[in-house]
């Protein structure tokens, strides 16, 4: 018969759009050899997995490349990694361990993933004061974004003379050379998480002294 096991931890997890979440899963400690097979994560009610390590199995197009089975039987790990979370990912999921040659496998309990609106905003760092005619490096960062996600796209909007400096995965530098007339104008850092199609921004007023 189909064997069942309980996913440890909460029955639901929350993630913001564009970010990442790990759905924890531990394989049963007593796993008969004949039951050992490939791992599959399913959306409740679906036949096609969202993630698997089965080389012959297709996964849902919507989750391909974003959902990954973290497979390590030595550590009993069968967790699901979700990156670039989208609203449509809001659902219940379960894990199944099965060999295609066998009638039965191991099926986990369900876990709900709740995808909320992105409320995190970028941080703009201005080192020291802005002086007319003096160049300064402004940094826009999204330190709350996850490493494994699709790198975000940074955009800057300003009336002041600017050029782009170096960028890292989660930060962008803007070189600004303000003029007296730029005092009180807006400077916006816009960050787009293309993997999920969401954008967040922060606007500050320039204080040129």
């Amino acid at each position: 018969q189909e064997r069942r096991f309980q996913l440890e931890g909460p029955e639901s997890l929350t993630v913001q759009e564009g970010l990442c979440v790990l759905v924890p899963c531990r394989l049963p400690t007593t796993l008969p050899a004949s039951y050992y097979g490939y791992g599959y994560w399913f959306l409740e009610g679906a036949d096609v997995p969202v993630a698997t390590n089965d080389p012959d199995e297709e996964v849902q197009e919507e989750t391909r490349g974003r959902f990954h089975l973290l497979w390590d039987p030595r550590r009993k790990n069968c967790s699901l990694s979700i990156r670039d979370a989208r609203r449509r990912d809001n659902a219940a999921y379960f894990f199944r361990l099965k060999s295609k040659w066998m009638k039965y496998g191991y099926t986990s309990s369900k876990l709900s993933v709740r995808v909320m609106a992105l409320t995190h905003r970028p941080k703009i760092l201005i080192p020291g004061t802005l002086e007319p005619g003096h160049s300064k490096n402004l940094t826009c960062s999204v330190s709350w974004a996850c490493e494994q996600g699709t790198p975000p796209i940074f955009s800057w909007l300003s009336a002041a003379p600017t050029s782009l400096g170096p960028r890292t995965t989660h930060s962008s530098v803007l070189i600004i050379t303000p003029r007296p007339q730029d005092h009180g104008t807006n400077l916006t850092c816009q960050v787009k998480f293309a993997g999920a199609g969401v954008t967040t921004e922060r606007t500050i007023q320039l204080n040129v002294t």
Epitope: A33, S34, P73, R74, W101, M102, K103
Partner: antibody, heavy 116, light 107 residues
Amino acid sequence: EVQLLESGGGVVQPGRSLRLSCAASGFTFSSYGMHWVRQAPGKGLEWVAVISYDGSNKHYADSVKGRFTISRDNSKNTLYLQMNSLRAEDTAVYYCARGGQTIDIWGQGTMVTVSS
Amino acid sequence: DIVMTQSPSSLSASVGDRVTITCRASQSISSYLNWYQQKPGKAPKLLIYAASSLQSGVPSRFSGSGSGTDFTLTISSLQPEDFATYYCQQSYSTPYTFGQGTKLEIK
């Protein structure tokens, strides 16, 4: 007690056919994948074929593809290997084995000798 | 097909020795590796599955490790009944190929 008992082996001439049987007992046969593995005299193990619990899925080693057919009768708790166009290199002990991606139970084997 | 290569092909050791047998796959097989023991005139017996999981009833002196392409079977302290031939087998994709075997003999 889980048991697999092979039968049907013997001496056969090249080009002829032979059917091996494997009687299973002590477990729910219809829930398990089943394999045939062979071992030529003094040689290592060679995986031959696998069949899914319901017979809907089958895979073969390249060396026997098109000549051997694996099948099962769940009502009789029996696994079969139909061997056609036999060659000298098919001479081996044939083991029936239980499992999915891991073989956990083996039969004692039946000897097949292909010789003129 | 995935080719499994075992080394050494034969090995002489004494009771109490620590012995290591290695198995290499021609491509990544994740953790889908099994180890079997076979004694002359007998059917093989499953020792380790999923690269490192000990089969029920197998003594704890047997252990397996590895992932991807390189795997190891270790016998921590050889017992007289351990002298046999050992085979690795990949169960990642069909055909489920075996290594050529490692014969463990008494020194």
